[in-house]
């Protein structure tokens, strides 16, 4: 069962698996949630001990029964991991802690104007896990405004001390705020010859990359495949680092694969969720339970529902024995990875999907695209919404995209003449406008946030957020789209689609069925040539065919320009403006979402 509340002055007795330092009980709970085995924790505040070295300790605990005896202890705060909960879990921690110094290896010291600048510096430094900033009131003159960047092997502080006039906080890499580049390529037949910080077993290079991305110290990895000549190293995932942040030496070796941590774009890739099945494969580990079930999917479901299960192996039934039920072995290990991987055993193995909720919902795979035709099918664009106005009569006003469970991203120009959010209705999971009746459920709009630099669509800043009155429950037909990652600034998107209920030609009407069109992106230089009377800024992005024929049009405004990259859909543009519709050499102009990621996060995470 999911228990989110914290228990003050309560200590959970026993079950200790690790002790870390965290600046708050709330952060301790997040650390526990991300630890492969932690189910409960006890955090020691300042008042709990005479010994300052015991302050801010976060003791991570496990229990076969999923509970532990409670003991009264002043200043202790205890609670449960969010593993048992179904809600979204984020490692992002934007809190700034006053008069605390989180200890680690101080590897960079420089002047910063503010704690925010120091935090940004940490976020954009490949090694930085957390920082301490000496404010201008710090007693030691030379240290005033000094920003210390820190890292540790575990990503958590080695200690936390009280220190007047300083502030401390964490890197915001896990908040999608890093400007560091993301190298998504996996290099075949390559070994990175740098120091290993850890090694785990993985069934493929992509799981290895996810483990590296989740590991605070891992910057790149090498994976030895099943065909690697040295048997003892097969399926071995080596987590690596270097001072420069890049591999110093690349060695050509067949049957090895290497790649990079995706820590700075982890919000738009699955990091925790290993959803594949591995056939003819056994995962070894500590056995939790053996249950007879029908099929490997059922076995995975069982593992997902058992909070301590990390991975499983399903042994299919022999012939027609046992009503076709095979044996489902639920397993765990100290680090969440199999202790050994055996091939050629006839088993089917995989991982719990319980951790999928630690990834952004937007990374979930959706139905495969329907090729051909212009009409969409249900669930094809689950982030697309239709925004209606009820004044003077109800009608479709604009498109929009779900980017969070209470947030719709759309265009600012949609709200010309809209006096109040009260007249707006957001319909989600809609394919045909004709589905919308008097009694069709909708989401009211609590707030319209228009970019304060917006004047008109053609001059840019054509972006707005709608805060919904209630939260959206995600399903196959309604879920968010990922924002582009700042680390993916150099990605060239080749699979982009514009969707909407807008006109098909300049003088037309709103379409009943959601339309789709695959449209190539156009460089800004090329786009500028087509719009000599306008300034095409880097905050705009253009898409269209030279010969015209396919384009967004009236009524599509605010809707998404969605691009698929590495199996994940990203909201690359917001339909904004253009000269006519689908005209020759007149591409559509879209708001370049990448340039507004900071603005979006600032508004939605406030």
């Amino acid at each position: 069962e999911c228990v989110t509340r914290l228990f003050k002055d309560i200590h959970f007795e026993g079950g200790d698996i690790a002790t870390v330092f965290t600046p708050s009980a709330k952060h301790c709970q997040v650390v526990c949630t991300h630890h492969p085995r932690c189910l409960l924790f006890t955090f020691t505040g300042e008042s709990a001990s005479e010994d300052p070295t015991q302050w801010f300790t976060c003791v991570l605990k496990d229990s076969v029964t999923e509970t532990l005896p409670r003991v009264n202890r002043t200043g202790a705060i205890s609670g449960y991991s969010f593993k048992q909960c179904s809600h979204q879990i984020s490692a992002c921690n934007k809190d700034i802690y006053v008069d605390l110094d989180m200890k680690g290896i101080n590897y960079n010291s420089s002047l910063a104007k503010s704690a925010q600048e120091c935090q940004e510096r940490c976020t954009d430094d490949i090694h930085c896990h957390f920082f301490t900033y000496a404010t201008r009131q710090f007693p030691s003159l030379e240290h005033r405004n000094i920003c210390l960047l820190k890292h540790t092997q575990t990503g958590t502080p080695t200690g936390i001390m009280k220190l007047d006039k300083v502030v401390t906080g964490f890197s915001l890499k896990s908040c999608a705020l890093s400007n560091l580049a993301c190298i998504r390529d996996v290099f075949p037949n390559t070994v990175f010859a740098d120091s290993n910080i850890d090694s785990v077993m993985a069934p493929d290079a992509f799981v290895c990359r996810r483990i590296c991305t989740h590991h605070p110290g891992c910057l790149f990895f090498t994976f030895f495949s099943q065909e690697w000549p040295k048997e003892s190293q097969r399926n071995l995932c080596l987590l690596k680092t270097s001072e420069s942040g890049l591999p110093s030496t690349r060695i050509k070796k067949s049957k090895a694969l290497s790649g990079f941590s995706l820590q700075s774009c982890r919000h738009s890739i699955p990091v925790f969720c290993h959803s594949s099945f591995y056939h003819d494969t056994d995962f070894l580990g500590e056995e939790l339970d053996i249950v007879a079930v029908k099929g490997h999917e059922a076995c995975q479901k069982l593992c997902t529902n058992a909070v301590r299960c990390q991975f499983f192996t399903y042994a299919p039934a022999q012939a027609s024995c046992n009503e076709g039920k095979g044996k489902c072995y639920l397993k765990l290990s100290s680090n969440g990875s199999p202790t050994k991987i055996l091939r050629g055993t006839g088993g089917i193995s995989g991982y719990t999907l319980r951790l999928c909720k630690m990834d952004n919902e937007c990374t979930t795979k959706i139905k495969p695209r329907i090729v051909g035709g212009t009409a969409s099918v249900r669930g094809e664009w689950p982030w697309q919404v239709t925004l209606h106005t009820t004044s003077p009569t109800q009608r479709h006003l604009c498109g929009g995209s779900i980017i969070g469970n209470q947030w719709i991203l759309t265009a600012a120009h949609c709200f010309y003449g809209v006096e109040s959010p009260k007249i707006l209705r957001v319909y989600i999971g809609i394919l045909n406008q004709s589905e919308i009746k008097e009694d069709t459920s909708f989401f009211g709009v609590q707030e319209i946030i228009i970019h304060d630099q917006y004047k008109m669509a053609e001059s840019g800043y054509d972006i707005a957020l709608l805060k919904l009155e209630t939260t959206v429950n995600y399903t196959d037909s309604q879920r968010p789209i990922c924002l582009p990652s700042k680390g993916d600034r150099n990605v060239i998107y080749t699979d982009c689609w514009v969707t909407g209920w807008g006109y098909r030609k300049l003088r037309d009407k709103i379409q009943n069925t959601l339309q789709k069109a695959k449209i190539p992106l156009v460089t800004n230089d090329e786009c500028q040539k087509r719009y000599r009377g306008h300034k095409i800024t880097h905050k705009m992005i253009c898409a269209g065919y030279r010969e015209g024929g396919k384009d967004a049009c009236k009524g599509d405004s605010g809707g998404p320009l969605s691009c698929k990259h590495n199996e994940v859909w990203h909201l690359v543009g917001i339909t904004s403006w253009g000269e006519g519709c689908a005209q020759r050499e007149r591409p559509g102009v879209y708001t370049n979402v990448l340039e507004y990621v900071d603005w979006i996060l600032e508004k939605t995470q406030a």
């Epitope: 101080n106 420089s110 002047l111 007693p139 030691s140 003159l141 030379e142 240290h143 000094i146």
Partner: antibody, heavy 124, light 107 residues
Framework: QVQLVQSGAEVKKPGASVKVSCKAS????????MHWVRQAPGQGLEWMGI????????SYAQKFQGRVTMTRDTSTSTVYMELSSLRSEDTAVYYC?????????????????WGQGTTVTVSS | EIVMTQSPATLSVSPGERATLSCRAS??????LAWYQQKPGQAPRLLIY???TRATGIPARFSGSGSGTEFTLTISSLQSEDFAVYYC?????????FGGGTKVEIK
């Protein structure tokens, strides 16, 4: 052992510039700040400015603002102090002195290691 | 800027005697004060920092006290090698400033 070795004596004409170097050894160069202090003949000590060798940020005394430039070369663990538009009053011994350890937030400190000094004479 | 004033300008003391040097700040510098010793032809040497903490290798006969605006350096029993010029310096605000110095000479 920890030491700061400065460049040799200089004789300059008024209006010229002088660049004094200070090479650090025996400690992690980028972990400590570096000050420049001067002393005119028979006079007291006068603080000129400070450089953080890690990021290269500087802070100068108002009196020298616009005339002094402090730089560093991390590859050779050397800091430089350049004083331009020299006048006779700039005749002095120029010292570099190690300041605070910047990799920890300590409260109090002093200039604990000094260079041997570089005599700069400005004369027409 | 903070003005540091040292007194006396010259102090004549016999070896083995106690010497007391004063330093006054034009505004509070808390405990952010250092004392240096300088002998002719040599670079200054750090004696005391934080108003009262002896630097590494400094003999126990040197002690510092005071906070705010009034500070004292005491040499409990002067040795022949202690005859030099002593400077105080504030570390509380930019620009860093030194006192004019006190010359301790043999009586």
């Amino acid at each position: 052992q920890v030491q700061l070795v400065q460049s040799g004596a200089e004789v300059k004409k008024p209006g010229a510039s002088v660049k004094v170097s200070c090479k650090a050894s025996g400690y992690t160069f980028t972990s400590y700040s570096m000050h420049w202090v001067r002393q005119a003949p028979g006079q007291g000590l006068e603080w000129m400015g400070i450089i953080n060798p890690s990021g290269g940020s500087t802070s100068y005394a108002q009196k020298f603002q616009g005339r002094v430039t402090m730089t560093r070369d991390t590859s050779t663990s050397t800091v430089y102090m350049e004083l331009s538009s020299l006048r006779s009053e700039d005749t002095a011994v120029y010292y570099c002195a190690r300041g605070a350890y910047l990799m920890e937030l300590y409260y109090y400190y002093g200039m604990d290691v000094w260079g041997q000094g570089t005599t700069v004479t400005v004369s027409s | 800027e903070i003005v540091m004033t040292q007194s006396p300008a010259t102090l004549s003391v016999s070896p083995g005697e106690r010497a007391t040097l004063s330093c006054r700040a034009s505004q509070s510098v808390s405990s952010n004060l250092a004392w240096y010793q300088q002998k002719p032809g040599q670079a200054p040497r750090l004696l005391i920092y934080g108003a009262s903490t002896r630097a590494t290798g400094i003999p126990a006969r040197f002690s510092g006290s005071g906070s705010g605006t009034e500070f004292t350096l005491t040499i409990s029993s002067l040795q022949s090698e202690d005859f030099a010029v002593y400077y105080c310096q504030q570390f509380n605000d930019w620009p860093l400033t030194f006192g004019g110095g006190t010359k301790v000479e043999i009586k």
